[in-house]
């Protein structure tokens, strides 16, 4: 017995260690709050949808809520989508949540909501208002918020959002919530910092509003805070992809010194785009446990040869002074200060977008004695020499990262390293900074209508690389040419990525011969020339290796391409040759003892193995150790019958999507004793296999999505007891029958996928919408797309 | 209106010691950093350190870190600094100032005699 | 450390008069600076802090200027009250007073 119908148009999940019955209905078209919750539900989302109203009745008998996400029911205009505008206001009812006893989090975020809403329950521990029309803070309105501890207000008054009035709170408002822990008014114009705030604040986001001046008292009580957030007043406008308005005289956001005093608990204070030009030491005299200072997008450039305030930061693991250039300013290197020496406590230094011609040795020295530093991120400098062997010095360091930089190869072998031979003198040079939009979003943090959360903050490193241990990222550089004495020194490094240079030699095994440790090279965008079998092979320890997006000499013909150079890559177990317009290969077989993944996406097969041509029907047969193979988007609007007998042996998952196939030679699957995956989505296929237990006895997952499949073969599933997902949406299947779809098969499935199919109601279909009312299997978007598209009156009807 | 005050005068003998006071109010004592400077006759002021009355952190100037200690007893608003091994080289006025980056009040001072 | 070279140490001047006193600090101090007057038997008493901004109640005939390393501070219209030391004090790292200029009458 089901204890919530399938007529549900929401995912119902158990979290059974906390206890919850989570019922998520985001995004379902829905105009009423659904029948049907299970009445122990404890978290319900509703978020991205079209309820006009709340009411008592609303939740009635979900007495057990503690958390409700009715956000984005009624976006506002200029925020929400231009195709489906709501222009009533979300209305909300007299004691709609009153009799909710447990109620601990409600989120009302973009509802166009002009009040905070009254008759809330005691119980409510966090509450969600950003994103409405909500400008005018009394403490009146919120006298029931006893029990407050997270409330988040902001973005109810900014460009976005705008409010054409002067953001107001009230003096003391906040005073009484006096559990208040985080209070978010960001994005909203406010301009002074709210006072007197509740002394039990942990975190406090002021940031993008139009505080000019923070007054000395300001933060005296806060003496719990550990989280402040202050950036965006008086912006650094500069390239800003905003609207963006700089205080008078593009001044900085003035604190006195003695502002932060009380914040003795303070771990994190952001001061992006404040346009300060100078950093008193004296603001953190007595924050002395502060972790993670963010100095980005100001005007430090000097700043940063002085940097007296280091002094006092004994504790601090992140700090970031990414674009702080003066502008029409092309610095010849780069001066930092001695006393970065002291930040024993250092793991990431971000310094982007300073702008400077040459990176030297000495430039890094006070970076030396840092036992803790990790991540050194250098990126956007528009640096154009650098000698990579003073990274040397830098062992410890699991990433130095020196993307989206200049840097090109020197003239000679000589020690000078990556350089170019443009003039040394100091350039008036205006770069482009908008690509990086970590640094150049309005709101970094921002919240979008599906996730509860802040988005995932911008990680620069590529994550599969990075895990493999010390990482030089040289990505989007000059760089034309590689050879061995540009990596000296560097043998301690685990991954290179190159991705997104010019480099277009002919690679023979030599060029990076001093890095013996080296386990990920990303040569993706680039221009490989595979003229030599050797590429790479001085690269003993290389597992992963990613030539992607180097099509340029493959597209061009009568050009030698030795695909053959896997076999002298004797522990590589992964390789992405995807995008290259492959179309012709000199060696015949690629061969491999230990390759375990190959991705060949976006080339050519339908070339080499056109019809009438079997060279290469073996390209991948002594790959030995494959398990995965990827050909999706090869054009294949056939596959020949060679091909599977072509196929390595040991091969799990293989990839066909996005190929224009028409047919399928099912049988020739018996090739395939260990295959388990099988996608052959986004394909023109019309027709499944008369039974599938005939063609492969091990497959488990079967995805034939974006197909043109009309009708199912009678004993299509018979004896299929292996199978574990079948993915059959987005297709045009009319009827499944009972025999199509045996009980004893079916009852074995993970996972069923039937939407966006052509379902016809009849009398025919009666087994199919009994079975698809009782069975347990897994299928999602029963309620709302598995639909039919007739007879008459049962157009557009959930089959269920 | 805020008011720093410190006795007029202390008369000890050398090799004792001494502790001075300095009693705040008009403002809340434990939010803001508190300093001790000393002038000797016709010399200029000496920075000698500071505390912070909210946790009893304290800074010393590296000349004054053996014989100086500073304290402070927030039920009274009072901070005071004990001097130890005194000699005619402690011979001073001693102000104490509340600080607010620079320093905005001063108490009178206090007179210290180190004589037998 | 940064140190406050105050100059003069001691300066004779007429009632009605105006005088100047400047610091110069070994390193640009980013206006961190402050001006005190102090007599006998009385506790320093502040007239300006960030360069030039004048302490309420402190009459508009004390000024205060400068940038970077070099700062100065007036009186102009000197009055009978106005004899006392005065003293710089830089505040942008630690603290550091100068030694002092001692105003005399003539």
């Known amino acids: 017995a089901r204890w919530f119908p399938k007529t549900l148009p929401c995912d119902v999940t158990l979290d059974v260690p906390k206890n919850h019955v989570i019922v998520d209905c985001t995004d379902k078209h829905l105009t009423e709050i659904p029948g049907g919750i299970p009445t122990n539900t404890t978290n319900l989302t509703l978020t991205i949808n079209h309820i006009p109203d709340i009411s008592p009745a609303s939740f009635h008998r979900l007495d057990h809520l503690v958390e409700i996400d009715f956000r984005c029911n009624c976006v506002p205009i200029p925020l929400g989508s231009k195709n489906n505008m709501c222009i009533k206001r979300l209305q909300i009812k007299p004691r709609s949540f009153s009799g909710l006893t447990y109620l601990k989090s409600l989120y009302l975020d973009g509802n166009q909501l002009l009040e905070i809403p009254q008759g809330l329950p005691p119980s409510l521990q966090l509450l969600s208002l950003e994103a409405n029309n909500i400008f005018s803070i009394r403490k009146e309105n919120l006298t029931e918020l006893a029990n407050i501890e997270i409330l988040y207000l902001g973005q109810n008054c900014y460009y976005r959002n705008p409010c054409y009035v002067s953001y107001s709170i009230e003096k003391d408002a906040f005073l009484n919530l006096t559990k208040l822990k985080v209070l978010s008014l960001k994005d909203n114009n406010v301009t002074a910092v709210p006072t007197v705030l509740p002394s039990t604040l942990t975190e406090l986001y002021l940031y993008n509003n139009m505080i000019a001046k923070i007054q000395e008292d300001d933060f005296n009580n806060l003496n719990q805070l550990q989280i402040l957030d202050l950036s965006g007043n008086c912006p650094r406008c500069y390239n800003a992809p905003f609207p963006c308005a700089p205080c008078k005289n593009n001044s900085p956001l003035q604190i006195p010194v003695n502002a932060f005093d009380a914040l003795t608990e303070l771990k994190v204070l952001r001061l992006h785009s404040n346009s300060l030009q100078h950093v008193p030491p004296r603001w953190f005299k007595n924050i002395n446990k502060l972790q993670e200072l963010d100095l980005s997008q100001n005007f430090l450039a000097k700043e940063i040869g002085d940097a007296k305030f280091l002094h006092f930061l004994p504790s601090l693991i992140q700090l970031d002074l990414s674009f702080n250039f003066e502008l029409q300013v092309y610095r010849a290197s780069m001066n930092l200060s001695q006393a970065f020496s002291s930040l024993k406590s250092l793991k990431i230094l971000r310094i982007r977008g300073y702008v400077f011609k040459e990176l030297k040795s000495f430039n890094l020295s006070p970076l030396h004695n840092l036992q803790n530093l990790e991540v050194l991120d250098l990126g956007t400098n528009f640096i154009k020499i650098a000698n990579l062997s003073m990274f040397k010095q830098f062992k410890r360091l699991k990433v130095i990262d020196l993307s989206v930089n200049k840097i090109s190869p020197s003239g000679d072998s000589s020690e000078v390293g990556f350089c170019s031979n443009a003039r040394t003198s100091v350039e008036s040079y205006e770069p482009q900074v908008l690509e990086q939009l970590h640094y150049f979003r309005y709101d970094k943090y921002a919240r979008s209508c599906r996730f509860k959360n802040k988005e995932a903050s911008f990680m620069s490193v590529n994550e599969s690389c990075y895990k493999y241990g010390q990482t030089l990222d040289l990505s989007k550089n000059s760089i034309f040419f590689v050879k061995s004495s540009d990596f000296q020194h560097l043998s301690f490094l685990k991954c290179l990525n190159l991705s997104g240079n010019l480099i277009s030699q002919t690679l023979n095994g030599s060029e990076f011969q001093p890095l013996a440790e080296l386990r990920y090279l990303d040569f993706s965008n680039n221009r490989l020339d595979l003229l030599h079998s050797t590429a790479f092979e001085e690269l003993h320890k290389l597992e992963v290796l990613d030539i992607s997006s180097n099509s340029h000499y493959f597209q061009s013909e009568g050009i030698t391409h030795m695909l053959n150079f896997t076999k002298n890559l004797k522990v590589l177990q992964k390789l992405m040759m995807n995008d290259n317009d492959i179309s012709s290969s000199t060696s015949r077989t690629m061969e491999s003892e230990s390759l375990r993944t190959l991705e060949f996406r976006g080339n050519h097969l339908d070339v080499l193995w056109r019809e009438g041509d079997n060279r290469y029907l073996q390209l991948f047969k002594n790959l030995l150790k494959l398990e995965e193979l990827d050909i999706s988007k090869n054009s294949l609007s056939f596959l020949p019958s060679g091909v599977f007998d072509g196929m390595p042996p040991n091969l799990k998952n293989l990839s066909l999507a996005k190929n224009g196939l028409k047919s399928f030679s099912w049988k020739k699957l018996q090739c395939l004793k260990n295959l388990e995956t099988l996608d052959l989505s986004h394909n023109q296929l019309t027709t499944v296999p008369e039974r599938l237990s005939n063609c492969s006895r091990s497959l488990k997952n079967l995805i034939l999505k974006n197909n043109q499949i009309r009708s199912l073969t009678k004993y299509f599933l018979q004896d299929a007891f292996q199978l574990r997902y079948l993915d059959l949406s987005s297709n045009k299947i009319q009827m499944i029958q009972k025999t199509s779809f045996p009980e004893n098969v079916l009852n074995n499935l993970k996972m069923l996928l039937l939407h966006h199919n052509r379902f016809l109601c009849t009398c025919d279909a009666v087994w199919f919408v009994w079975w698809v009312n009782h069975t347990e299997v897994t299928i999602p978007y029963l309620a709302t797309d598995v639909t039919c598209v007739g007879p008459g009156a049962h157009k557009g009807q959930s089959v269920i | 209106q805020v008011q720093l005050q410190q006795p007029g005068a202390e008369l000890v003998k050398p090799g004792a010691s001494v502790n001075l006071s300095c009693k705040a109010s008009?403002?809340?004592?434990?939010?803001?950093?508190l300093h001790w400077v000393k002038q000797r006759p016709g010399r200029g002021l000496e920075w000698i350190g500071d505390?912070?009355?909210?946790?009893?952190?304290?800074n010393y100037n590296e000349q004054f870190k053996t014989k100086a200690t500073l304290t402070v007893d927030k039920s009274s608003s009072t901070a005071y600094m004990q001097l130890s091994s005194l000699t005619s080289e402690d011979s001073a006025v001693y102000f104490c100032?509340?600080?607010?980056?620079?320093?905005?009040?001063w108490g009178q001072g206090t007179a210290l005699t180190v004589s037998s | 450390d940064i140190q406050m070279t105050q100059s003069p140490s001691s300066l004779s001047t007429s009632l009605g008069g105006k005088v100047t006193i400047t610091c110069k600090a070994s390193?640009?101090?980013?206006?961190?600076i402050a001006w005190y007057q102090h007599k006998p038997g009385k506790g320093p008493r502040l007239l300006i802090h960030?360069?030039?901004t004048l302490q309420p109640g402190i009459p508009s005939r004390f000024s205060g200027s400068g940038s970077g390393r070099d700062y100065s501070f007036s009186i102009s219209n000197l009055e009978p009250e106005d004899i006392a030391t005065y003293y710089c004090?830089?505040?942008?790292?630690?603290?550091?007073f100068g030694a002092g200029t001692k105003l005399e009458l003539k």
């Open positions: 390193q640009d101090i980013n206006k961190y």
């Open positions: 505390i912070y009355p909210s946790n009893g952190r304290t």
């Open positions: 960030y360069t030039s």
């Open positions: 004090l830089q505040y942008d790292y630690l603290l550091t």
């Open positions: 100032a509340r600080e607010r980056g620079y320093f905005d009040y």
């Open positions: 008009g403002y809340t004592f434990t939010n803001n950093w």
